[in-house]
């Protein structure tokens, strides 16, 4: 990895061992320079592998609300608007970091957690399993 | 929102105002219960809107490495394996939380940051703009 010189103005770290506890400022800085208002907003409906978004709420997690995509069909939508089962709709998943309150119900103590979320769906050619 | 009683065993919070600084344990807990080994691994190649993954590295960020999807074509791959420009490949984007070292180069002090990443691509029907 890249070694970076430590800033002498850093706060003291009480625990140098891993697992380590760090200080995190929750005042979120939004670096999204992409100002395109449409973004993925209507793709869920226009996609050949359309999906619905489901609200997943957990007050013990930060962010407490995450939207999960579920593909509408196993097949993909063809040019006639019908489902074509020679193609497969599949979820595009991503591992993301969230903060989990630990101990539970604590407002200012968290643990990093990795969760798998489904962001949308894409249409793929099926894997053909050849029987010997 | 949902109000949860505070756990009396919580660490003290020095700053009760927002923006607030919280303690975060960086020993990541992996909650991925989905054991499907395939996941999205080969979808980028099999998709009708295929994409390439680009490594985005930033040592001042946690996680330092993020993979960004870039759609290979403007159109989508048809049944003959050719690009069909009557359909559009578009990136599926998601806002994710990362930790940004603040002050810079500090190993144990961070600020939450929201960034927009492209996770994969999907094939959509184009929006037709009618000229008056």
């Amino acid at each position: 990895g890249i070694t970076i010189p430590r800033n002498p103005g850093c706060p003291n770290s009480e625990d140098k061992n891993f697992p380590r506890t760090v200080m995190v400022n929750l005042n979120i800085h939004n670096r999204n320079t992409n100002t395109n208002p449409k973004r993925s907003s209507d793709y869920y409906n226009r996609s050949t592998s359309p999906w619905n978004l489901h609200r997943n709420e957990d007050p013990e997690r930060y962010p407490s609300v995450i939207w999960e995509a579920k593909c509408r069909h196993l097949g993909c939508i063809n040019a006639d608007g019908n489902v074509d089962y020679h193609m497969n709709s599949v979820p595009i998943q991503q591992e993301i970091l969230v903060l989990r309150r630990e101990p539970p119900h604590c407002p200012n103590s968290f643990r990093l957690e990795k969760i798998l979320v489904s962001v949308g769906c894409t249409c793929v050619t099926p894997i053909v399993h050849h029987v010997a | 929102g949902i109000t949860i009683p505070r756990n009396p065993g919580c660490p003290n919070s020095e700053d009760k105002n927002f923006p607030r600084t919280v303690m975060v344990n960086l020993n990541i807990h992996n909650r991925n219960t989905n054991t499907n080994p395939k996941r999205s691994s080969d979808y980028y190649n099999r998709s009708t809107s295929p994409w390439n993954l680009h490594r985005n590295e930033d040592p001042e960020r946690y996680p330092s490495v993020i993979w960004e999807a870039k759609c290979r074509h403007l159109g989508c791959i048809n049944a003959d394996g050719n690009v069909d420009y009557h359909m559009n490949s578009v990136p599926i984007q998601q806002e994710i939380l990362v930790l940004r070292r603040e002050p810079p180069h500090c190993p144990n002090s961070f600020r939450l940051e929201k960034i927009l990443v492209s996770v994969g691509c999907t094939c959509v029907t184009p929006i037709v703009h009618h000229v008056a």
């Epitope: 619905n52 489901h54 579920k70 069909h73 196993l74 089962y85 497969n88 998943q93 489904s118 099926p126 | -």
Partner: antibody, heavy 124, light 113 residues
Framework: QVQLQESGPGLVKPSETLSLTCTVS????????VSWIRQPPGKGLEWIGI???????DYNSAFKSRVTISVDTSKNQFSLKLSSVTAADTAVYYC??????????????????WGQGTLVTVSS | DIVMTQSPLSLPVTPGEPASISCKSS????????????LAWYLQKPGQSPQLLIY???TRQSGVPDRFSGSGSGTDFTLKISRVEAEDVGVYYC?????????FGQGTKVEIK
């Protein structure tokens, strides 16, 4: 507990529109989808269509031109409208909740809770 | 549309004895991406609405007794009751949820001998 209750007129004249309401309780509308299924007297089950959690719909092509499913979330009610009915539309009509499975990334078309059903007779 | 064919259409049973119902699909219900078979079984007791027993071929719905089991893959599926009880009488339906429209079998009537 989870409950679904169909209501509407038991008798509809041919060529008119059949209108039914399904009132639900005990589950979150934003998570679950609801299907309508019918069962002609002494016969099997026939899926009519579904309304997803976002208000989008998918219909059995056999009914597509004359069916509309909608939702009024403020009242926890789903509705089914079937136009231009004939005697062949005489059936018990059910609304049913589609199963929601966390960590499963497809909409589900198994129905895990059903209303008691309402008989609609098409006759002049 | 996918045709679901059940057999037998009528099944007289003796309490305590096993019973088996077959369901055949006109196309494979196995989804290659997750290796799941999109088949469910329902029981409609006399005068009641259907209730889900089994989904994804073999996963029992919560609260369903373990005397009910499902098996099969592709186009051929079976529902077994290891020891029939009096409360198991009614019409059993298989349903495929792979292809739209989602279709049901014609039903198998299970009754006590």
């Amino acid at each position: 507990q989870v409950q679904l209750q169909e209501s509407g007129p038991g008798l509809v004249k041919p060529s008119e529109t059949l209108s039914l309401t399904c009132t639900v309780s005990g589950f979150s509308l934003p998570s679950h989808s609801v299907s309508w299924i019918r069962q002609p007297p002494g016969k099997g089950l026939e899926w009519i269509g579904i309304i997803w959690n976002n208000g989008g719909t998918d219909y059995n092509s056999a009914f597509k031109s004359r069916v509309t499913i909608s939702v009024d979330t403020s009242k926890n009610q789903f509705s089914l409208k079937l136009s231009s009915v004939t005697a062949a539309d005489t059936a018990v009509y059910y609304c049913a909740r589609n199963m929601y499975i966390t960590d499963y990334y497809y909409e589900n078309y198994f129905m895990d809770a059903w209303g008691q059903g309402t008989l609609v007779t098409v006759s002049s | 549309d996918i045709v679901m064919t059940q057999s037998p259409l009528s099944l007289p049973v003796t309490p305590g004895e096993p019973a088996s119902i077959s369901c055949k699909s006109s196309q494979s219900l196995l989804f290659s991406e997750n290796q799941k078979n999109y088949l469910a079984w329902y029981l409609q007791k006399p005068g009641q609405s259907p209730q889900l027993l089994i989904y994804w071929t073999s996963t029992r719905q919560s609260g369903v007794p373990d005397r009910f089991s499902g098996s099969g893959s592709g186009t051929d599926f079976t529902l077994k009751i290891s020891r029939v009880e009096a409360e198991d009488v009614g019409v059993y339906y298989c349903q495929q949820s792979y292809y739209t429209p989602y279709t049901f079998g014609q039903g198998t009537k299970v009754e006590i001998k």
